[in-house]
Structures are given as structure tokens and as C-alpha cells.
Amino acid sequence: ESGYAQNGDLEDAELDDYSFSCYSQLEVNGSQHSLTCAFEDPDVNTTNLEFEICGALVEVKCLSFRKLQEIYFIETKKFLLIGKSNICVKVGGKSLTCKKIDLTTIVKPEAPFDLSVIYREGANDFVVTFNTSHLQKKYVKVLMHDVAYRQEKDENKWMHVNLSSTKLTLLQRNLQPEAMYEIKVRSIPDHYFKGFWSEWSPSYYFRTPEINNSPGEMD
């Protein structure tokens, strides 16, 4: 191929919009961190496009991303997590667009798991509990959780409760009797790190009991 043709390819590439976004996940695999980037425009032709991160790394100047379908991905222990890195989209060794990012400000926590709901008959309430892998982590330990629940028939009528613990009590009187509910939870960094909401946990489904009328009460 001639250098001229490659030049032409480069000129065509420069006309495209290569806006991208990234998120980091710290200690996602033991002491390994990950960084995931993707183009904002899903129609971008990613053939020959590469991502590279430089700066604020341990022992190396730069790292190249691996490409997995339409996303670009790094898993490494080499993020310093102090200061800004430069993340660039490259073609043929030339940078098309770059962003300076502190990886501790684009943290996406792992999704909570083991969500369950237990009904306490005597207390007339529901105890919601869930787990998060972040309780065991060195860095992103403090999270804000968003518990969302809805009556299954009300498609877009989600109720939300924000909490910092992994336990929540829902009062029976605030829920419809004899109804099926769906509940799910997600997390976002709180204190010391910034970033994005995690994916939602798998949903849990529970049914509320009928109202028990006391003896002597009229129906």
C-alpha cells in the first residue's frame, strides 16, 4: 500500500467523531484494576483504531488496550491511581483524540449481589439485605446504594431509597397488600472516589401478604 493511500485514510479518519467514555474498576480481580473505554457513537468504524493510556502508571510509560468487540479494555496492577493519565484513540500510531483523566474519578463499582427480602410477620415489615464485594476492598470501600422497587404491574413507577448500609427495612403499611413486587439495587462511589452507578443487581421478586383483620373488625 502506498503512503499516500494511508494518508488519505488518516484524513478520512480525522473527519469522524471519536468521542469516547471510560470507566475504571479498582481491585476488580484481586489487586488488579481494569479500565474500559468505548466510543459514544456506536456506528464508528473501529477497524484499525486503538486505545492507549500514558502517564500515572507504575514501571511503564504507556499501556495498550485489548479490543473486545466494540469495547477496549485493560486489566493491570500498573495504575498509580494518583494524578492524571492521557487516554488516546490512535490509528497508525497517530493520536486522533485524547482525554486527560484521573482514574479515581471514573470509578464504576461492581454490582451488588445476593439481594433478598424477608418478611417479618410480628414487625409487619420487610427486611431487605444485599451484599457488595467492596466491603473487602482496600480502596473503594464507601458506597452509596440505590434500592429501587416497584409493584410489578406498575412498569415505570419505581420507588428509590438511597442508603450507605446494606440493609433496609420497608414497612408493610407503605406497600400494597397481596401484590408482587420487584426490587433491585445498584451502587456508586461515595467519599474519596468519584464515578458512575454500577450495573443493577439481579432483581428479586416478593409478594406482600393480605391484610389480616383483627377479630371483631368489619370487612
Partner: nanobody
Framework: EVQLVESGGGLVQAGGSLRLSCESS????????MGWFRQAPGKEREFLAA????????HYSDSVKGRFTISRDNAKNTVYLQMNSLRAEDTGRYYC???????????WGQGTQVTVSS
């Protein structure tokens, strides 16, 4: 104008302690990484410690690990270096730096002198 001002240096006996402060007038302080360096007479400036914008992440050189502690107070725009078990070889001029951007520190203070006598 001076944007980073170090203080707290002085003469101390070996085995003693000092606490250095560095006050920043840079508007982005609370989102910037900060670092401490020193330069001994006739030697290159060497990295000692760095801290991320929130204080959650710190990094130390092997020569000071376990003896020095870096911390910050974003409400006061100040970064600190607590130095314990000081040795004669810790003598030098101590500098703070701000905004670690793609492996380059963007701002530097004028330094404060630390002398450890044995």
C-alpha cells in the same frame, strides 16, 4: 505569584521528627494530586511521597516508606509530610509539587530546608 509555600523545616537531631506543610493557592487544589520531593546537596531531586486528590491513595519511595506519612486537608488547601525517625541522609531541601499530569508535576514550591544532625 508564589502558588505553593512550604514551611516547617529546620534543624533536628537524628531520630527526631518534623512536620512539613505546603499551602497551595491554586484553585484546583482539591482535585489535584500532590507530592513531596527532596534535594540533597550535590544530588538530583528525588521523589518521596505522593497523594491523590481525596487522600485515599498514597505512594512512597522505598527510602521513606514506614517513616514518612503524607496527608492533606482539602479545606485548608494544605498537604503535609510527617517525618519520623529522621536520619542524617534525610538532610536536604524539601519541595512540594502539585498536579501530576501525564507524569509531569505542573507546579513547584520554593522549598524548605531540613537539616538532620547526628
Amino acid at each position: 505569584e508564589v502558588q505553593l509555600v512550604e514551611s516547617g523545616g529546620g534543624l533536628v537531631q537524628a531520630g527526631g521528627s518534623l512536620r512539613l506543610s505546603c499551602e497551595s493557592s491554586i484553585s484546583t487544589f482539591s482535585s489535584d494530586a500532590m507530592g513531596w520531593f527532596r534535594q540533597a546537596p550535590g544530588k538530583e531531586r528525588e521523589f518521596l511521597a505522593a497523594i491523590g486528590w481525596s487522600g485515599a491513595v498514597t505512594h512512597y519511595s522505598d527510602s521513606v516508606k514506614g517513616r514518612f506519612t503524607i496527608s492533606r486537608d482539602n479545606a485548608k488547601n494544605t498537604v503535609y509530610l510527617q517525618m519520623n525517625s529522621l536520619r542524617a541522609e534525610d538532610t536536604g531541601r524539601y519541595y512540594c509539587a502539585e498536579d501530576y499530569d501525564t507524569d509531569v508535576w505542573q507546579y513547584w514550591g520554593q522549598g524548605t530546608q531540613v537539616t538532620v544532625s547526628s
